[in-house]
Interface confidence: medium
């Protein structure tokens, strides 16, 4: 069976039907490049006006305009708000009332696309394996990133969150149109990784999505993650404005100027520093969501009532922090280089600025307790990775799980830890699962490109797709079309239950109280320390500021600094970094 032309609110669309075997039978209908919205530069997205005739939806559209990996050029385009759909089909009748899984990609709110990285036409976020193995519809889409997606003056002139509103428009489009593709509009699961996972979390918290989302999965990211909300958007807006020659004193004039500036210039005006800086790298993630009083009406911690009826799976990778540790403490990955106490303390203090010296000291002390017994470089390096994993991923996720559970009415809550070790040959032998290592398994790459993987990798992928798609179908990862290796019990506040995802999942994979000592430290000991306010520190910005971003500002409840100009010698910067 195949769909043929499908009528949507914008007009007819026609995709391609791909047979899954030479003998015929099962197939998948694939639609690529359906427009779901339009947007002008630094404006909220609007519904797409539609088209005449039949839209041939056979090719991925270009990603939203963003800097290349070298940050010295751009690729993609401004006209980028398109989505892609995979619909599994049986032999005889076309599918109907299938669960729908809408994917939100990660990339630090700075990069990425709905199709994902591409090697020889093998796209990372190809939805085929999930769709066909789990018998669900998969939708991926593009949203605006970087300055074009998240630049904000912190007021009505440029409220920001354009990328989040794009995501919402995609979800709303799916709600309105997916029935025509055989999907159940009342059973939409949104899932995402990293910035996409935080986006999933933010979408569930936003009042704009009331009634749109039935379930959600966040893989390595939450609205509560310290890198997910920008507390001082005006600082970064002014930084960009200065670079492109726009006025900065009046936000109205600045916004008007920025909106008519070449989008490529806006995009290239910001560079994420990838070499070690004074602060941890996540502090330089400038263009990310903001609390705008509208789409995100309040601090995310206060919005959990909005998730009372949304089933949730949330988890992290056991060494999610490794990627960030390699930037902040480069010696972590270098066998011939050593990590020192000073390196680690500098990292710790950079992540605990709000609590001043006492916060840094207490954090340093608890994390280095094991060093007296085992002062080996392996142990010290693992501590650095564990610390970054805790601060950036584990603690926010655990707090979010607890909030979700505490506010749940009909909603169910599940937690996991992905521990299947990275396959990167250059990594240290002690390496676990790095940030984004889970993606290939969720998207079925060990099946799509079997020669690149081992049987154990396929076991992991099979289990994850089974749990994920069962959850999308029923709200319970154990119940659905796919058999699972062991029963995944829901998260409880008392036990902190989680599933440890490895190559061999058994009943012993259900565990409790992940890193409880450290969770208690952050939630209790660290939390009660007095917050340091109004502190300044003086940093010398990099000489060539085309290379890196300026020093990050504080939460704008503190003194708002003057961003460094190209010729400044020292930049004043309050020490609290809005974590």
């Amino acid at each position: 069976a195949k769909l043929g032309a499908v009528y949507t609110e914008g007009g007819f669309v026609e995709g391609v039907n791909k047979k899954l075997s030479l003998l015929g039978g099962d197939s998948v209908d694939i639609f690529k490049g359906i427009p779901f919205a339009t947007a002008k530069t630094l404006e909220n997205p609007q519904r797409h006006p539609g088209w005449q005739g039949t839209l041939k939806a056979t090719n991925f559209k270009k990603r939203c305009l963003q800097a290349t990996i070298t940050q010295d050029n751009t690729y993609g385009q401004e006209d980028c708000l398109y989505l892609n759909i995979w619909v599994p089909q049986g032999r005889k009748q076309v599918s109907h009332n299938l669960p729908v899984m809408v994917w939100i990609y990660g990339g630090a709110f700075l990069m990425g696309s709905g199709q994902g990285a591409n090697f020889l036409k093998n796209y990372l976020y190809d939805g085929e394996e999930i769709a066909t193995r789990g018998n669900v519809i998969v939708v991926t889409f593009n949203y605006r990133v970087g300055p074009l997606g998240f630049l904000s003056t912190g007021d009505a002139n440029l409220p920001g969150n354009f990328g989040l509103r794009d995501q919402h428009m995609a979800i709303a489009w799916v709600k309105r149109n997916i029935a025509a593709f055989g999907g159940d509009p009342d059973n939409i699961t949104i899932f995402g990784e990293s910035a996409g996972a935080a986006s999933v979390s933010l979408q569930t918290l936003s009042p704009y999505n009331k009634g749109l989302i039935r379930r959600a999965i966040s893989q390595s990211g939450m609205a509560l993650s310290p890198w997910a909300i920008q507390k001082n958007p005006l600082f970064w807006a002014k930084t960009i404005a200065k670079k492109v020659g726009c006025p900065t004193e009046d936000t109205g004039k600045m916004a008007a100027c920025l909106k008519i500036t070449d989008p490529r210039a806006l995009t290239l005006a910001y560079k994420l520093p990838v070499k070690k800086q004074e602060y941890p790298v996540v502090h330089y993630l400038a263009f990310i969501p903001v609390i705008d009083g509208d789409f995100i009406p309040d601090d995310p911690i206060n919005l959990y009532n909005n998730t009372a009826d949304i089933d949730y799976i949330a988890g992290i990778n056991n060494m999610d922090g490794h990627l960030f540790a390699t930037i902040d403490v480069p010696a972590v990955d270098k066998t011939k280089q050593t990590v020192t106490e000073e390196d680690f303390y500098r990292l710790v203090s950079g992540h605990t600025v709000a609590k001043g010296l006492k916060g840094a000291q207490a954090t340093f002390d608890i994390y280095t307790e094991s060093w007296a017994q085992d002062p080996s470089q392996e142990n010290m390096k693992k501590t650095v990775v564990a610390f970054e994993t805790d601060v950036l991923f584990l603690i926010p996720t655990e707090i979010a799980l607890a909030q979700h559970k505490a506010h749940a009415k009909s909603a169910k809550t599940y937690s996991y830890l992905f521990s299947h070790p990275s396959r990167m040959p250059i990594y240290p032998k002690w390496m676990g699962a790095d940030h984004a290592d889970d993606l290939q398994y969720v998207f079925g790459k060990p099946f799509a490109t079997p020669l690149g993987y081992r049987p154990q990798d396929r076991a992991v992928s099979k289990a994850m797709i089974a749990y994920w798609t069962n959850f999308a179908r029923s709200g319970d990862p154990n119940m659905g079309n796919s058999p699972v290796p062991t029963h995944w019990y829901p998260y409880t506040l008392e036990n902190g239950n989680y599933l440890d995802i490895t190559k061999t999942i058994t009943s012993a994979s259900m565990k409790e109280h992940l890193r409880e000592k450290f969770l208690k430290f952050w939630a209790v000991t660290f939390e009660v320390l007095p917050t340091v306010t109004g502190d300044q520190d003086t940093l010398t910005p990099p000489e060539d500021d085309s290379e890196v971003a300026p020093d990050p500002p504080s939460d704008d409840s503190q003194v708002v600094p003057v961003p460094p100009t190209d010729d400044s010698v020292e930049a004043q910067m309050p020490a609290t970094i809005g974590f």
Epitope: E278, Y279, T340, E341, E342, F344, Y345, R346, S349, G350, T352, V353, K355, G356, L357, K358, A360, Q361, F364, D365, T368, P530, V532, D535, Q536, D537, T538, L539, T540, A575
Partner: antibody, heavy 119, light 105 residues
Framework: QVQLVQSGAEVKKPGASVKVSCKAS????????MHWVRQAPGQGLEWMGV????????SYAQKFQGRVTMTRDTSTSTVYMELSSLRSEDTAVYYC????????????WGQGTLVTVSS | DIQMTQSPSSLSASVGDRVTITCSAS?????LHWYQQKPGKAPKLLIY???KLPSGVPSRFSGSGSGTDFTLTISSLQPEDFATYYC????????FGQGTKLEIK
Amino acid sequence: QVQLVQSGAEVKKPGASVKVSCKASGYTFTSYNMHWVRQAPGQGLEWMGVINPSDGATSYAQKFQGRVTMTRDTSTSTVYMELSSLRSEDTAVYYCARDYYGSSPLGYWGQGTLVTVSS
Amino acid sequence: DIQMTQSPSSLSASVGDRVTITCSASQSISYLHWYQQKPGKAPKLLIYAASKLPSGVPSRFSGSGSGTDFTLTISSLQPEDFATYYCHQRSSYPTFGQGTKLEIK
């Protein structure tokens, strides 16, 4: 990149007070303790006290209790050490020194300020 | 206060010599640190936590010991090593040893 820059030399009369400053840069000022250590001519190093720039808390060596006051100004990332009731034996080079990490050795030192007490 | 006693107070040695300086604490301490000071300059951290070298410190310097007795060793003296060396403890109120002056023979 860590720099501690101290104020210039001072000459004081016995009974007077002196206030030495130490301006920090290149790191998060509130994340590291700052100590004051002095060294009389031809003598060894003598710890005077420490200030937590985060909250202004101080701890002084018994010998200097009542005579020394350490303060900080977070807006300028500067710490100050004031020593009162000066005597000739207070003639020394006064150093500010920052923790290396946590509660650790003194990893970074100012260039020193010579205070001469003479009638 | 914990008293720190260094020995010897001074010693003469030649370039290429192996030199050992000891530091004794009046009671057991967790960590001991060593500093090098040249005339007219601020002290410089040489060894921390008894045996660890900060970046930039040559590997000819080494430290050992625990409890109350600690040692600083320079395996092969270089001309720039002639200076005064201080031990330092941070277990209670910080205190320094009286210093060991290393001179050219």
